[in-house]
């Protein structure tokens, strides 16, 4: 009778085991073990027992002890079960961002591991078990579907294998996959709201505001604002589930024409975009040209107004004839024209909007000097000792210098309050002098003596 010890062994893959073959007879002709495994007979005194070390056990095996005794040959098998944890435990790759409300399929693949009867695959969210199944097939695959919720944001999903050898007196061997961190998001179907000027003048600044509500998590939203190829650098302010991105936009002559203003919001693996066209225009103020800005009285003056080729101008309220970018008028300069404003108003239509620009020039007319009766009366009669202010206004451009002298030396204090005395009486020669010439006028002052009763 041949016996073997142990009759059943569970050992790690690549491990070794000592197997004792025994026979019930004292002097067996033969005692040995039959196995494809590498083996060594170890030291064991006596004839009816032999110990073998079987090494590098890679798979389940059934070595057989045999003995040949006088009463015949017999055999006994030992059952070697190899255990090993899986070589690969992996969650199938998924995009890290998942929209709320989507069904997410988690797929775990397990390669290797034995004995399969003791191997279980567990899908987890954090520490919560979502699914538990025995490992079947090579590779074993376990799947489960999760409806993505907002509160799943940041949750770790993983796959764990459990090789439970506790019934065999060993331990529970666990292998866990690399975790998959879920990032959930909500990006509304409505495009972002974009507020910006429809038209923008070259070398000016405009403000663009892009906003959107109903985002989650709003802090993860990326906002891209661009005008044509120019990336704008917005200042973003966040609300609970909204944001507002504000940016200044500067345009130059190179940008002239119709440009696309885009606001793109990227969250997770989705984006929403709003497009708007902004017309960049160049519209300098119209040019008011005077033949000469300063002319002498009686000179013929031409006033021209020139604007953008597509503009329509009015000069001093009078539209150009024909309606267009140029207008002009002719006049003979009079003193009344001095300081007269010539205003040109130009109107340009840009993307359906009317843009107005004005330019004003003033005409200076040189005239005079003038001394007339109205402003410089020729005769004054004042009571003696009364308070009087002699008035004499000389006109002209430039304003003339005025001096009134009696006998060439005694001045009449023009514009000053004086007490009328006998000395004031007499004829004064008032002389108004400017670069334009000189005029004189005689002014007589009469002083009335009081009557003594």
């Amino acid at each position: 009778q041949t016996s073997v010890s142990p009759s059943k062994v569970i050992l790690p893959r690549g491990g070794s085991v000592l197997v004792t073959c025994s026979t019930s007879c004292d002097q067996p002709k033969l005692l040995g073990i039959e196995t494809p495994l590498p083996k060594k007979e170890l030291l064991l005194p006596g004839n009816n027992r032999k110990v073998y070390e079987l090494s590098n056990v890679q798979e389940d095996s059934q070595p057989m002890c045999y003995s040949n005794c006088p009463d015949g040959q017999s055999t006994a098998k030992t059952f070697l079960t190899v255990y090993w944890t899986p070589e690969r435990v992996e969650l199938a790759p998924l995009p890290s961002w998942q929209p709320v409300g989507k069904n997410l399929t988690l797929r775990c693949q397990v390669e290797g591991g034995a004995p399969r009867a003791n191997l279980t695959v567990v899908l987890l969210r954090g520490e919560k078990e979502l699914k538990r199944e025995p490992a079947v097939g090579e590779p074993a695959e376990v799947t489960t579907t999760v409806l993505v919720r907002r509160d799943h944001h940041g949750a770790n999903f993983s796959c764990r294998t459990e090789l439970d050898l506790r019934p065999q007196g060993l331990e529970l061997f666990e292998n866990t996959s690399a975790p998959y961190q879920l990032q959930t998001f909500v990006l509304p179907a409505t495009p972002p709201q974009l507020v910006s000027p429809r038209v923008l003048e070259v070398d000016t600044q405009g403000t663009v505001v892009c906003s959107l509500d109903g985002l989650f998590p709003v802090s993860e939203a990326q906002v891209h604002l661009a005008l044509g190829d120019q990336r704008l650098n917005p200042t973003v302010t966040y609300g609970n589930d909204s944001f507002s991105a504000k940016a200044s936009v500067s345009v130059t002559a190179e940008d002239e024409g119709t440009q696309r203003l885009t606001c793109a919001v990227i969250l997770g693996n989705q984006s929403q975009e709003t497009l708007q066209t902004v017309t960049i225009y160049s519209f300098p103020a119209p040019n008011v040209i005077l033949t000469k800005p300063e002319v002498s009285e009686g000179t013929e003056v031409t006033v021209k107004c020139e604007a953008h080729p597509r503009a329509k101008v009015t000069l001093n309220g009078v539209p150009a004839q024909p309606l267009g970018p140029r207008a002009q008028l002719l006049l003979k300069a009079t003193p009344e024209d001095n300081g007269r404003s010539f205003s040109c108003s130009a109107t340009l239509e840009v993307a359906g909007q009317l843009i107005h620009k004005n330019q004003t020039r003033e005409l200076r007319v040189l005239y005079g000097p003038r001394l007339d009766e109205r402003d410089c009366p020729g005769n004054w009669t004042w009571p003696e000792n009364s308070q009087q202010t002699p008035m004499c206004q000389a006109w002209g451009n430039p304003l003339p210098e005025l001096k009134c002298l009696k006998d060439g030396t005694f001045p009449l204090p023009i514009g000053e309050s004086v007490t009328v005395t006998r000395d004031l009486e007499g004829t004064y020669l008032c002389r108004a002098r400017s670069t334009q010439g000189e005029v004189t006028r005689k002014v007589t002052v009469n002083v009335l003596s009081p009557r003594y009763e």
Epitope: L18, K39, K40, E41, L42, L43, L44, P45, G46, V51
Partner: antibody
Framework: QVQLVESGGGLVQPGGSLRLSCAAS????????INWVRQAPGKGLEWVST????????FYADSVKGRFTISRDNSKNTLYLQMNSLRAEDTAVYYC??????????????WGQGTLVTVSS | DIELTQPPSVSVAPGQTARISCSGD??????VHWYQQKPGQAPVLVIY???KRPSGIPERFSGSNSGNTATLTISGTQAEDEADYYC??????????FGGGTKLTVL
């Protein structure tokens, strides 16, 4: 440290008796099989005897069977070799040596310094 | 009964590789151990279970065992390696068996 120290060797006449001792220290004596190995002058090593860890099993080389007795006192951490009917060919240095914890592999990892037994008239 | 046969002597130049053989019937089916013994000293285990090195034994000592022959190899032999080397195995009777020993001379 782990140590084995032999004693009791000396000159003895043929047919005489001698008891060798081997004092063990630095390890759990009662867990190991212990051996006696001898070496005749100018010759090689020869296994003499082995005793199991609890003393219940003893093994001898054919050359000493019936004349030598191996024993141990685990309470004293001591191994003995009682040698009777000594012959001139028993003249040798006697070493005690510890067999590794798993005696199945049969190698000796710790040796004493040896004690000389001379059998001569 | 197993008998282990070793060459009585092996010579090697310093730095060269020394190989000491130990032969016996179906020796590869059992484990072989090797001991180094210097004059006047007790043996020291240098290789056990065919090819394993105890702690403290230099890496230049290695062993192999297959078929009927076990071999102790000393690569880059040094003067201090000069000693007697014994192989050892086991059988049911006698229980433990030593080879006759090989004297290694470092030239």
């Amino acid at each position: 440290q782990v140590q084995l120290v032999e004693s009791g060797g000396g000159l003895v006449q043929p047919g005489g008796s001698l008891r060798l001792s081997c004092a063990a220290s630095g390890f759990t004596f009662n867990s190991y099989y212990i051996n006696w190995v001898r070496q005749a002058p100018g010759k090689g090593l020869e296994w003499v005897s082995t005793i199991s860890s609890d003393g219940s099993n003893t093994f001898y080389a054919d050359s000493v069977k019936g004349r030598f007795t191996i024993s141990r006192d685990n309470s004293k951490n001591t191994l003995y070799l009682q040698m009777n009917s000594l012959r001139a060919e028993d003249t040798a240095v006697y070493y005690c040596a510890r067999t590794t914890l798993n005696y199945y592999y049969g190698y000796m990892d710790v040796w004493g310094q040896g004690t000389l037994v001379t059998v001569s008239s | 009964d197993i008998e282990l046969t070793q060459p009585p002597s092996v010579s090697v130049a310093p730095g060269q590789t020394a190989r000491i053989s130990c032969s016996g019937d179906s020796l590869g089916s059992k484990y072989v151990h090797w001991y180094q013994q210097k004059p006047g000293q007790a043996p020291v285990l240098v290789i056990y279970s065919d090819k394993k090195r105890p702690s403290g034994i230099p890496e230049r000592f290695s062993g192999s065992n297959s078929g009927n022959t076990a071999t102790l190899t000393i690569s880059g032999t040094q003067a201090e390696d000069e000693a007697d080397y014994y192989c050892q195995s086991y059988d049911s009777n006698p229980m433990l068996v030593f080879g006759g020993g090989t004297k290694l001379t470092v030239l």
